[in-house]
């Protein structure tokens, strides 16, 4: 359920507020609907960087849960093959705040277009 993913993103944003994490993360800020699964997989990979950088057990657990929820939601969409989409490394690097903002945006796209 994508709304549960949103809920975990809110938890992560609440948890990182008191931390100073300098990491920049590959961020897709203008997702084409035909590349949304590819983009989501990039977001999930980059999310693990936040987990590692924070060194925080609560963030680690929430990230782990979010990844499971998101992968379950992706698999329920069937095996979608997307072509002509950007590789994660081709995406713009952004700070954590902008990364999370764009992450919420793409999850919302999955909700809105379901």
């Amino acid at each position: 359920n994508w709304v549960n993913v949103i809920s975990d993103l809110k938890k992560i944003e609440d948890l990182i507020q008191s931390m100073h994490i300098d990491a920049t993360l590959y961020t897709e800020s203008d997702v084409h609907p035909s590349c949304k699964v590819t983009a989501m997989k990039c977001f999930l990979l980059e999310l693990q960087v936040i987990s590692l950088e924070s060194g925080d057990a609560s963030i680690h657990d929430t990230v782990e849960n979010l990844i499971i929820l998101a992968n379950n939601s992706l698999s329920s969409n069937g095996n979608v093959t997307e072509s002509g989409c950007k590789e994660c490394e081709e995406l713009e690097e952004k700070n954590i705040k902008e990364f999370l903002q764009s992450f919420v945006h793409i999850v919302q796209m999955f909700i809105n277009t379901s």
Partner: antibody, heavy 119, light 108 residues
Framework: QVQLQESGPGLVKPSGTLSLTCAVS?????????WSWVRQPPGKGLEWIGE???????NYNPSLKSRVTISVDKSKNQFSLKLSSVTAADTAVYYC????????????WGQGTLVTVSS | SSELTQDPAASVALGQTVRITCQGD??????ASWYQQKPGQAPILVIY???NRPSGIPDRFSGSSSGNTASLTITGAQAEDEADYYC???????????FGGGTKLTVL
């Protein structure tokens, strides 16, 4: 600075169709944002009508869904609202608004246009 | 329920602090945004996300959330803060945007 401007008839007859257009300037309707219509009956609160993404995806308020159509015209950088089978209860100020990226918000609003439903 | 509930009215003495609240189960999943609306004018976004202010919004406005409640706090209220305030979020399905009923703030 993004600006939004609503236009359309200020008076619609009962059982007719309300049609409004929102012209977007200072930004592209083909940005990552969703675009919404919101209304406010005189002396009452705000009610979300529906939203559109430039690829044509739409979502509508369930209470209005059977009567609402929102469309986008990328060549004119505008989006439109049609509300059918109107009654006096649809009399309101109608606003177009741009949704922010990420968490729910409307970061830019039109100035609003009053539409009265009356014979 | 997908509704967002606000108290219809609130008041604050000039220069004092007031907190306006918004309740709804969906706020466990989503942050709320807050709008100020003065008579005859379009709403203006004052707070969005965790506690973000658009440029031009004074820092006396702040937002917070806990459980199913979001709050807008005005610290050192000014006469020009007298207005209607609305909260906004998505419903529990995530598909639909919803508004609270609004709170009319009077500055005494």
């Amino acid at each position: 600075q993004v600006q939004l401007q609503e236009s359309g008839p200020g008076l619609v007859k009962p059982s007719g169709t309300l049609s409004l257009t929102c012209a977007v300037s200072g930004g592209s309707i083909s940005s990552s944002n969703w675009w919404s219509w919101v209304r406010q009956p005189p002396g009452k609160g705000l009610e979300w009508i529906g939203e559109i993404y430039h690829y044509g995806y739409t979502n509508y308020n369930p209470s209005l869904k059977s009567r609402v159509t929102i469309s986008v015209d990328k060549s004119k950088n505008q989006f439109s609202l049609k509300l059918s089978s109107v009654t006096a209860a649809d009399t309101a100020v109608y606003y177009c608004a741009r949704e922010g990226i990420g968490w729910p918000s409307f970061d830019y609003w039109g100035q609003g246009t009053l539409v009265t439903v009356s014979s | 329920s997908s509704e967002l509930t606000q108290d219809p009215a609130a008041s604050v003495a000039l220069g004092q602090t007031v907190r306006i609240t918004c309740q709804g189960d969906t706020l466990r999943n989503y942050y709320a945004s807050w709008y100020q609306q003065k008579p005859g004018q379009a709403p203006i976004l004052v707070i969005y996300g965790k506690n973000n202010r658009p440029s031009g919004i004074p820092d006396r406005f702040s937002g917070s959330s806990s459980g199913n409640t979001a709050s807008l706090t005005i610290t050192g209220a000014q006469a020009e803060d007298e207005a209607d305030y609305y909260c906004n979020s998505r419903d529990e399905s995530g598909k639909n945007l919803v508004f609270g009923g609004g709170t009319k703030l009077t500055v005494l």
